[in-house]
């Protein structure tokens, strides 16, 4: 079944997908679509690359990594519940039926309003699943040990920065990766 990833409403969601170009600059077209991967192409395309560049994208969908090195992971900005769904990353390797297809499940969690605690030192208790990634292997959790008192807005900002930077590296191991050539 598909691999599952999570984000909260209002955050950026990250869906990992990678390939290794046969040679530097020798890129393979990639498409991202909403809905499970069909037999050919991508349905409901949200972003597409060709042999040189990103040639089609829609608002809120972008590639944060270096796609020229094969990092075609999708970032969805400021997600809503409607962004929940299956996303297809399709690496369009030349030749008949050579494409690599990956279905990634994105679950968006409602941001429930809860009273702000007076002191919050254990961030993983405040955001128990927000910093957990799901991949092919066992779940990996980023733990933010004891930090000075900061407010919930700062926690949320920190969580987003963690997701967009350190987690991106960790997810490379659990996301969709193929080697070409």
């Amino acid at each position: 079944s598909e691999v599952e990833y999570r984000a909260e409403v209002g955050q950026n969601a990250y869906l990992p997908c990678f390939y290794t170009p046969a040679a530097p600059g020798n890129l393979v077209p990639v498409c991202w679509g909403k809905g499970a991967c069909p037999v050919f192409e991508c349905g409901n395309v949200v972003l597409r690359t060709d042999e040189r560049d990103v040639n089609y994208w829609t608002s809120r969908y972008w590639l944060n990594g270096d796609f020229r090195k094969g990092d075609v992971s999708l970032t969805i900005e400021n997600v809503t519940l409607a962004d929940s769904g299956i996303y297809c990353c399709r690496i369009q390797i030349p030749g008949i039926m050579n494409d690599e297809k990956f279905n990634l499940k994105l679950v968006i969690k409602p941001a429930k309003v809860t009273p702000a605690p007076t002191r919050q030192r254990d961030f993983t208790a405040a955001f128990p699943r927000m910093l957990t990634t799901r991949g092919h292997g066992p779940a990996e959790t980023q733990t933010l040990g004891s930090l000075p008192d900061i407010n919930l807005t700062q926690i949320s900002t920190l969580a987003n920065e963690l997701r967009d930077s350190r987690l991106a590296n960790d997810l490379r191991d659990s996301g969709a990766t193929i080697r070409i050539g």
């Epitope: 999570r6 409901n44 929940s84 769904g85 499940k105 679950v107 968006i108 969690k109 409602p110």
Partner: antibody, heavy 119, light 106 residues
């Protein structure tokens, strides 16, 4: 592998109560809404309600409000549906379903529990 | 409650035919409609969510379309194993289902 295993068939008297169970495996119920749906013969599907097992928040269809109670035990990964003041109209198959996430559509269904209300 | 109406209780078709099942919502539900398939003696299975997105493992011959109040579920080339009841469901507010359309294969 995701599975929802429901309790066995029940036969109860009118006016009585019943508690159905749904034990999940392959996922943590704290990460998804869990729903109950009923299906009466030739009457299609009717949503009863749902629970967020993470904080026990529930929501019910108006026609079941006050008569249905959905609970969850996160330690055993099990959800329950209790129905009270049963009538013959409650004779149906009851499905436990897992939400896609928090979306109110359902990607996994249990095998169903047949409830017969008869004197 | 939002009422979902499937106007045809039964539809008869032949293998390799194209068939469309319609569903009408009593008020605007945007694109928040799912479609399920229930084969005899089985639990329902999710096919389409958010009006047009195929769920994992669902064959390409199943498609969904529509927004607002009018929705269509299409099987582009009916197979014998598609004999089932098909239900629409709105997930815009408190979930409600259509009455179902039974697909009969001639």
């Amino acid at each position: 592998e995701v599975q929802l295993q429901q309790s066995g068939a029940e036969v109860v008297r009118p006016g009585a109560s019943v508690k159905l169970s749904c034990t999940s495996s392959g996922f943590n119920i704290k990460d998804y809404y869990l729903h109950w749906v009923m299906q009466r013969t030739e009457h299609g599907l009717n949503w009863i309600g749902r629970i967020d097992p993470d904080d026990a928040e529930t929501k019910y269809a108006p026609q079941f409000q006050g008569r249905a109670t959905i609970t969850a035990d996160t330690s055993s990964n099990t959800a329950y549906l209790q129905l009270s003041s049963l009538t013959s109209e409650d004779t149906a198959v009851y499905y436990c379903t897992r939400d896609f996430g928090y979306t109110d559509y359902f990607d996994y269904w249990g095998q169903g529990t047949t409830l017969t209300v008869s004197s | 409650d939002i009422v979902m109406t499937q106007s045809h209780k039964f539809m008869s078709t032949s293998v390799r035919d194209r068939v469309s099942i319609t569903c009408k919502a009593s008020q605007d539900v945007s694109t928040a409609v799912a479609w399920y398939q229930q084969k005899p003696g089985q639990s329902p299975k999710l096919l389409i969510y958010s009006a047009s997105y195929r769920y994992t493992g669902v064959p390409d011959r199943f498609t969904g379309s529509g927004s607002g109040t009018d929705f269509t579920f299409t099987i582009s080339s009916v197979q014998a194993e598609d004999l089932a009841v098909y239900y629409c469901q709105q997930h815009y507010s408190t979930p409600t289902f259509g009455g179902g359309t039974k697909l009969e294969i001639q």
